[in-house]
Amino acid sequence: LPRWRQQWSGSGTTSRFPETVLARCVKYTEVHPEMRHVDCQSVWDAFKGAFISKYPCNITEEDYQPLVKLGTQTVPCNKTLLWSRIKDLAHQFTQVQRDMFTLEDMLLGYLADDLTWCGEFNTFEINYQSCPDWRKDCSNNPVSVFWKTVSRRFAETACGVVHVMLNGSRSKIFDKNSTFGSVEVHNLQPEKVQALEAWVIHGGREDSRDLCQDPTIKELESIISKRNIRFFCKNIYRPDKFLQCVKNPEDSSCLSGI
């Protein structure tokens, strides 16, 4: 008889989750020479160990520490790109501007990007039927805690001038409840980070407003300044330029500096 399984509100673990994580790890370590020493089987064991057999509403950052340790990686100063509510454009940007890095360009972020996972208390099984939803079920679920953990670490290790890409088309350009607003902003280290520069991406060329004057950006500036980190903001009016450069990275009009 099939055993009783808790029904959660969120979608279940991504199909072929173990195989996907292992394959991504192998691919990443092949492409990034500085991570060739990483043993992908150990990485998977540490990942699995963080949530398997555990009640999926009681996961802690501590559970992910073995994985975080194995995935330790540093970004050169001035090369960290954070983002909020504009993931695709941020990723397209770092695909072209290869010397800048989002969390998803790092091993751990790359492994988990767009995946869902959870286990069950007292069983070694992975739950492919449903996983806890952050709002409807609980915030301390395996996926949310993972991103909180690795985002905190990513922000803590940033240095120099840190950039963040924000979506100017949203009602809250800076959202205190986003991962950027609730985790990363508060974990930038003032002794290492000289400044945070926000890039506010406009919806199109016809929008000529100064979105750096938006009240939520002023709120971000206040939070950052109180932490003794300088704050700068730039309006970016040309998302079409980003996309043009993504499609034609060799186009010489895309090669000049930021």
């Epitope: 072209v96 890039w199 040309r238 330029k241 186009d251 010489s252 895309c254 000049s256 500096g257 930021i258």
Partner: antibody
């Protein structure tokens, strides 16, 4: 090397028309947005019009909207500016400029030598 | 649209530092480029994206931008730097400052 050569300028009466051309060489013309910038005698620079790399999007300064039309022929590596209903205040040297830039911003890295348009009766 | 204001002229002795300002409401929120134009010639890009120098432009040219003012600095000015200088920004359309004539005394 990049070269932009404007032509078609001259003396025209108020209300008249003129078509400027800009012949481009030394780069892949179809990869770049192009612009027209003008400079009235003894005055500063004023952006007039721009066109995307494939000509699908066009942009105009308010001062010329409805009177000027920018176009391009990528097969001929040529940029055009059709100027109608010309006024005395349109008198200027017209420069063709290539729009360069990063993902973040845009500027004009290459300019032609300009062609003088004089609107006078 | 953002309005960019430049001083009509700046006078500097050879070898000294010339600073050309370009002011505009919160101009620091926009990227600024600078052009040099000599009489009878087309403009030449000397600074883009606030502080980047195109190849071939001497190191004595530098740029900065914050608050309400962008600045083009020419350190150790030389006779050939005598020209008009224009700042330019972009907010969906291109906007130029009125230009500054740099005179070498």
């Amino acid at each position: 090397q990049v070269q932009l050569v404007e032509s078609g300028g001259g003396l025209v009466q108020p209300g008249g028309s003129l078509r400027l051309s800009c012949a481009a060489s030394g780069f892949t013309f179809s990869s770049y947005a192009m612009n027209w910038v003008r400079q009235a005698p003894g005055k500063g620079l004023e952006w007039v019009s721009g066109i995307s790399s494939w000509g699908s999007s066009t942009y105009y300064a308010d001062s010329v909207k409805g009177r000027f039309t920018i176009s391009r022929d990528n097969s001929k590596n040529t940029l055009y500016l059709q100027m109608n209903s010309l006024r005395a205040e349109d008198t200027a040297v017209y420069y063709c400029a290539r729009e360069d830039g990063s993902y973040m911003t845009d500027y004009f890295a290459y300019w032609g030598q300009g062609t003088l348009v004089t609107v006078s009766s | 649209d953002i309005e960019l204001t430049q001083p009509p002229s700046v006078s500097v002795a050879p070898g000294q530092t010339a600073r050309i300002s370009c002011s505009g409401d919160n101009i620091g929120h926009y990227y600024v480029s600078w052009y040099q134009q000599k009489p009878g010639q087309a403009p030449v890009l000397v600074i883009y994206s606030d502080s980047n120098r195109p190849s071939g432009i001497p190191e004595r040219f530098s740029g900065s931008n914050s608050g309400n003012t962008a600045t083009l600095t020419i350190s150790g000015t030389q006779a050939e730097d005598e020209a008009d200088y224009y700042c330019q920004s972009y907010n969906g359309t291109y906007v130029f400052g009125g230009g500054t004539k740099v005179e070498i005394k």
